[in-house]
């Protein structure tokens, strides 16, 4: 009679992660008699996946009843496969001895590929704010995919981006991997509305690929313009003067008038507008009664902006063009500004 | 109890081979990967390879291939290592152990041979 | 390959003191580690297996442990005979490895 050989017809088998993995092996004889193990990995660094004849191995069922006197077949199935069972199995005929079974012939070896879905992306951007015409920094990271090919693209606004770096760990081979990608992108001071892509394409994904994504909202700071005018006189001793703070990204901003340097109010932008680009505007408007200042006065607009260096617009009001009132040393009324906006 | 008895203190020559052996005793031969270790003098140890007695499957270090040669004979349960080519650097104390068939956690390394003592000398 | 850096590579402590060995491993070997303990004649001896698990017949003063890829040899309460040279070696990956060595001194 032929000596034994153990059949393994498949030479791999590719299966998603969650699934359930059927290795198949037959042998061709009933002779010699003994148990067959199922190992993972050859050398002595294999792993037993499946004894027959001992052990508890709740993952593996058989596919035949190997307690049939007459059975050849040894195939198996592994349920919930993930990524650290790939590997290649090996189907091994013992031979019955005493005091311990002896290897007697081994199948060629069935390699288990597993497909597994990369997670989410996470985009992540820079800690601290940025303005406009600076160039930020993105993080993309995708892991736990199986096999190792992934695509990652970039998109701001639907525009595809061509500055950045990919990496795939491990280099080596690993049972699951990880992407890391950073991008750079230039700041506009359009970008509040805008959105920062990262989109992975994988094999297990049928074409319909995985996005992250950051809003520039939370990355860009757009510092306001500012415009101090002179309103017409509205009464004969009095003047009023606007502070415009334009275009400010994002609302965080305290205004400070100063008469002379010295400070006359301090407020909190609280009621603003909203331009259709996603910026602010804010007006802040003070009443000065001329007729207390004997001289010119230096009217000094300052702005904080979300915690940046104060920046300050200056406005002469010349006092001399404005008859005195006697006797009234009122300099301004802190008369609040938010009731009125100019958009 | 398991127990591995290795040859004798070797001096050789440059350029020669040295054949070492280790005897196992106390549990089944077949049942085990045979490996051997090298220790140079005040060094630490290296994994030369590994021999599994049932089909003569070996596995080496890259840094041993062609220099190391092993070897079983099952029915005296022992295990043969053959060094070639001998130079200085050869000269070390090597060790035989074992690990169990499959990746047994319990069973890598457990049991050493006392060492066989090789000298390269001109 | 996988590369175990062992330190130090020279200890100096007295008797009745704690002393921990660590080995630290380059890739991953999961709980896949040994702990050796080499006497001078030569003679080597397992102390630890799996990382944790001591080796029947071996002191309870002698404890294995692992934090990330560090993986560390605890003796607490130094004997006489304890002072003598110990290595790691990891078994996850071919060619296994071992680190360089703790020489242990009594002070």
């Known amino acids: 009679e032929e000596e034994l050989q153990v059949i393994q017809p498949d030479k791999s088998v590719l299966v998603a992660a969650g699934e359930t993995a059927t290795l198949r092996c037959t042998a061709t004889s009933l002779i010699p008699v003994g148990p067959i193990q199922w190992f993972r990995g050859a050398g002595p660094g294999r792993e037993l996946i499946y004894n027959q004849k001992e052990g508890h191995f709740p993952r593996v069922t058989t596919v035949s009843d190997l307690t049939k006197r007459n059975n050849m077949d040894f195939s198996i199935r592994i349920s919930n496969i993930t990524p650290a069972d790939a590997g290649t199995y090996y189907c091994v005929k013992f031979r019955k001895g005493s005091p311990d079974d002896v290897e007697f012939k081994s199948g060629a070896g069935t390699e288990l590929s597993v497909r597994a879905k990369p997670s989410a992306p996470v985009v992540s951007g820079p800690a601290a704010r940025a303005t406009p015409q600076h160039t930020v920094s993105f993080t993309c990271e995708s892991h736990g995919f199986s096999p190792r090919d992934i695509t990652l693209k970039w998109f701001k606004n639907g525009n595809e981006l061509s500055d950045f770096q990919t990496n795939v760990d491990p280099v080596g081979e690993s049972v699951s991997y990880s992407i890391h990608s950073t991008a750079k992108v230039v700041l506009t001071r359009e970008d509040v509305h805008s959105q920062v892509i990262c989109e992975v394409a994988h094999v297990t994904l049928q074409g319909d690929p995985l996005r992250g994504t950051a809003n520039l909202s939370e990355t860009i700071r757009v510092p306001p313009t500012l415009e101090v005018t002179q309103q017409p006189v509205r009464a004969e001793n009095q003047v009023n003067v606007t502070c415009q703070v334009r275009k400010f990204y994002p609302q965080r901003l305290q205004l400070t008038w100063l008469e002379n340097g010295n400070v006359s109010r301090t407020e909190t932008a609280s009621t603003v507008t909203e331009n259709k680009d996603g910026t602010y505007n804010w007006m802040s408007w003070l009443l000065v009664n001329v007729s207390a200042h004997r001289d010119d006065v230096k009217l000094t607009c300052q702005v904080e902006h979300d915690g940046q260096p104060a920046v300050s617009k200056s406005h002469d009001l010349k006092v001399s063009a404005h008859p005195k009132e006697q006797g009234s040393n009122t300099a301004a009324e802190n008369t609040g500004s938010n009731e009125r906006n100019i958009y | 109890e398991v127990q591995f008895q290795q040859s004798g203190t070797v001096l050789a020559r440059p350029g020669t081979s040295v054949k070492m052996s280790c005897k196992a005793s106390?549990?089944?031969?077949?049942?085990?990967?045979m490996h051997w270790v090298k220790q140079g003098p005040g060094q630490g140890l290296q994994w030369i390879g590994a021999?599994?007695?049932?089909?003569?499957?070996?596995t080496y270090n890259q840094k041993f291939k062609g220099k190391a040669e092993l070897t079983v004979v099952t029915s005296t349960s022992t295990a043969y290592m053959e060094v070639s080519s001998l130079t200085n650097e050869d000269s070390a104390v090597y060790y035989c152990?074992?690990?169990?068939?499959?990746?047994?956690?319990?069973?890598?390394?457990?049991?050493w041979g006392q060492g066989t003592l090789v000298t390269v000398s001109a | 390959d996988i590369q175990m850096t062992q330190s130090p590579s020279s200890l100096s402590a007295s008797l009745g003191e704690r002393v921990s060995l660590t080995c630290r491993a380059s890739q991953d070997i999961g709980s896949r580690l040994n702990w050796l303990q080499q006497e001078p004649d030569g003679t080597i001896k397992r102390l630890i297996y799996?990382?944790?698990s001591l080796d029947s017949g071996v002191p309870k003063r002698f404890s294995g442990s692992r934090s990330g890829s560090d993986y560390s040899l605890t003796i607490s309460g130094l004997e006489s005979e304890d002072f003598v040279d110990y290595y790691c070696?990891?078994?996850?990956?071919?060619?296994?490895?071992f680190g360089g060595g703790t020489k242990l001194e009594i002070n």
């Open positions: 021999i599994y007695p049932v089909n003569n499957d070996t």
């Open positions: 152990t074992r690990s169990f068939y499959y990746s047994l956690d319990a069973a890598w390394f457990v049991y």
């Open positions: 070696l990891q078994y996850a990956s071919s060619p296994f490895t």
């Open positions: 799996a990382t944790s």
């Open positions: 106390g549990s089944t031969f077949t049942s085990y990967w």
